[in-house]
Interface confidence: low
């Protein structure tokens, strides 16, 4: 066959769907690879063809669109399963072509099983709620396009295994779940089950997401440098190892980049000739406030190194701070034999 622009297997879009539930999968060509949409392609006379490779097979085969009750169908650039079966797992390819043009991409589809408490190998999206921040809502995700607006589905929300009713601060509001005042105890997995009718059948959509209660922007502060500080002096003799920790506390801030760095005599360590290493560790509180520690290390410090300026810097969306470490050369203790000799007038 003639050449086809093959975008390969798009593993970035590993699609996971639950067994025995409807699934609608858009051809990724139009979303991520081509500069035109399906309507444009269709009106230009291009045809969208679907085929697949079963799990643990190499053979590409056409998708059977003649199954009972139209279990698998295609509508525009969407491949529909009503519903999925476990053995639908595999790599799916959509190909757009006419006599002069061809472009295709493959993507993995995994049909996963869930238990009665909605546990499964599904990768869960994380929704962050601010602690004690007034009413916040999460919305049942990825249900658009499954039923027309004229259909009123029933929606049931669960936290873990338990149906949400009589909860202190969580109220089901249709597609939304409202948290009156989010607390650490609200951390967990929340599932919405959307039930809707279609052509005399009843379908269920199960969507689980992880709620993580994080620090509120109301309480956020600029970075706080705990170390170095004015109370600790790094006193070393030449030849010893110099270790200076820079420990910084960052309030949680949504989408903020937290940065810590050292300067030595106003320059980044990479820009100077001394043999310095920097190791970083990061820890988080329950509300995702962050503590970063960068340890500056010079294995064998020289007297020149002990005269340099070592400054720890930190920056977040809330501001930038800096603190210099107090570094000095240790005054050597008097050498006993020499002093004695001098004291007795020895020559």
């Amino acid at each position: 066959s003639e050449r086809c622009d093959d975008w390969g297997l798009d593993t970035m879009r590993q699609i996971q769907v639950f067994e025995d539930e409807p699934a609608r999968i858009k051809c990724p060509l139009f979303e991520h690879f081509l500069k035109f949409n399906y309507s444009t392609a269709h009106s230009a006379g291009l045809t969208l063809i679907w085929y697949w490779t079963r799990q643990d097979r190499d053979l590409e085969e056409p998708i059977n669109f003649r199954l009972p009750e139209n279990r698998i169908s295609k509508e525009k650039d969407v491949l529909w399963f009503r519903p999925t079966l476990l053995n639908d797992t595999g790599n799916y390819t959509c190909m757009l072509r006419n006599t002069t043009y061809c472009s295709k991409v493959a993507f993995p589809l995994e049909v996963v099983q869930k238990d009665s408490c909605f546990n499964s190998p599904m990768k869960l999206p994380v929704h962050k709620l601010y602690i004690e921040y007034g009413i916040q809502r999460i919305t049942c995700p990825n249900v658009d396009g499954y039923f027309p607006s004229s259909v009123k589905p029933t929606i049931t929300w669960y936290m873990g295994c338990y149906k949400i009713q009589n909860f202190n601060n969580v109220i089901p509001e249709g597609m939304n779940l409202s948290f009156l005042i989010a607390l650490i105890s609200n951390n967990g997995n929340y599932t919405c089950v959307v039930t809707y009718p279609e052509n005399g059948r009843t379908f269920h959509l199960t969507r689980t997401l992880t709620v993580k209660v994080v620090g509120s922007p109301k309480n956020a502060v600029p970075p706080v440098i705990h170390s170095p500080n004015d109370h600790v002096v790094y006193e070393k003799e030449p030849g010893e190892e110099l270790l200076i920790p820079c420990t910084v506390y960052f309030s949680f801030l949504m989408d903020s980049r937290n940065e810590v760095w050292w300067t030595i005599d106003g320059k980044k360590p990479d820009d100077i000739t001394i043999d310095v290493t920097i190791n970083e560790s990061i820890s988080h509180s329950r509300t995702e406030d962050e503590t970063r520690t960068q340890i500056l290390s010079i294995k064998k410090v020289t007297s020149e190194d002990l005269k340099r300026s070592y400054v720890c810097h930190a920056r977040s969306a809330k501001g930038e701070v800096a603190k210099a470490a107090k570094v000095k050369q240790k005054v050597p203790a008097p050498r006993y034999t020499v002093e004695l000799a001098c004291g007795f007038g020895a020559t």
């Epitope: 607006s149 009123k152 009713q165 909860f167 109220i171 089901p172 509001e173």
Partner: antibody, heavy 121, light 112 residues
């Protein structure tokens, strides 16, 4: 921010028809209920009915069923309250209000400025 | 339909003093989900009503914390811890458990 802007005051004669409007902005109009509330001169609030613009699902108070029609056009984010034949007793201030729906209940978190309807011969 | 009865009809208040309004429903407003479906609204003179409290005890956005709501399934109370001059107007309770939604007759709060 959320806003509900109602049409202006109306003076009508008994037997005439009327349609007043309520335009929503600053939020997803299709996905919140819009309720209508009547306040007769010097009196309290009376709930007339409610509509879900997403699919035009409408509920009426029995006192107003058949007396008024509630409708919505989600394409222009507008809800309507209409009468086919006004009576003098329809003289009142009419408010539209956005309804939140927690579970199966409503609360009205945003209100229009009101439309004064006067019916007099 | 559920009948809502408010008392008192009129409440003269002194700024800085507390105030309390009662609302009684003809049947329980306690939903099976554990929430009490009662809202409180304030209509200031010449203005549209505004939401103060929803689901019995939750303050709406922007409502000062001097306002609080409480109650059982049928007896509800709106409290103002320290009345301010701007709190004058007519207070309405509304049951939100089932349609038709019904309002109480209102309590007029005025400065002594």
């Amino acid at each position: 921010q959320v806003q509900l802007v109602q049409s202006g005051a109306e003076v009508k004669k008994p037997g005439e028809s009327l349609k007043i409007s309520c335009k929503g902005s600053g939020y997803s109009f299709s996905s919140h209920w819009i309720g209508w509330v009547r306040q007769m001169p010097g009196k309290g609030l009376e709930w007339m009915g409610i509509i879900y613009p997403g699919d035009s699902d409408t509920r009426y108070s029995p006192s107003f069923q058949g007396q008024v029609t509630i409708s919505a056009d989600k394409s222009i984010s507008t809800a309507y309250l209409q009468w086919s034949s006004l009576k003098a007793s329809d003289t009142a201030m009419y408010y539209c209000a956005r309804g939140e729906l927690p579970g199966e209940a409503y609360y009205f978190d945003n209100w229009g400025q009101g439309t004064l309807v006067t019916v007099s011969s | 339909e559920i009948v809502m009865t408010q008392s008192p009809l009129s409440l003269p208040v002194t700024p800085g003093e507390p105030a309390s309004i009662s609302c009684r429903s003809s049947q329980s407003l306690l939903h099976s989900n554990g929430y009490k479906y009662l809202d409180w609204y304030l209509q200031k003179p010449g203005q549209s009503p505004q939401l103060l409290i929803y689901l019995g005890s939750n303050r709406a956005s922007g409502v000062p914390d001097r306002f609080s709501g409480s109650g059982s399934g049928t007896d509800f109370t709106l409290k103002i811890s320290r009345v301010e001059a701007e709190d004058v107007g007519v207070y309405y309770c509304m049951q939100a458990l089932q349609t038709p939604l019904t309002f109480g007759g209102g309590t007029k709060v005025e400065i002594k």
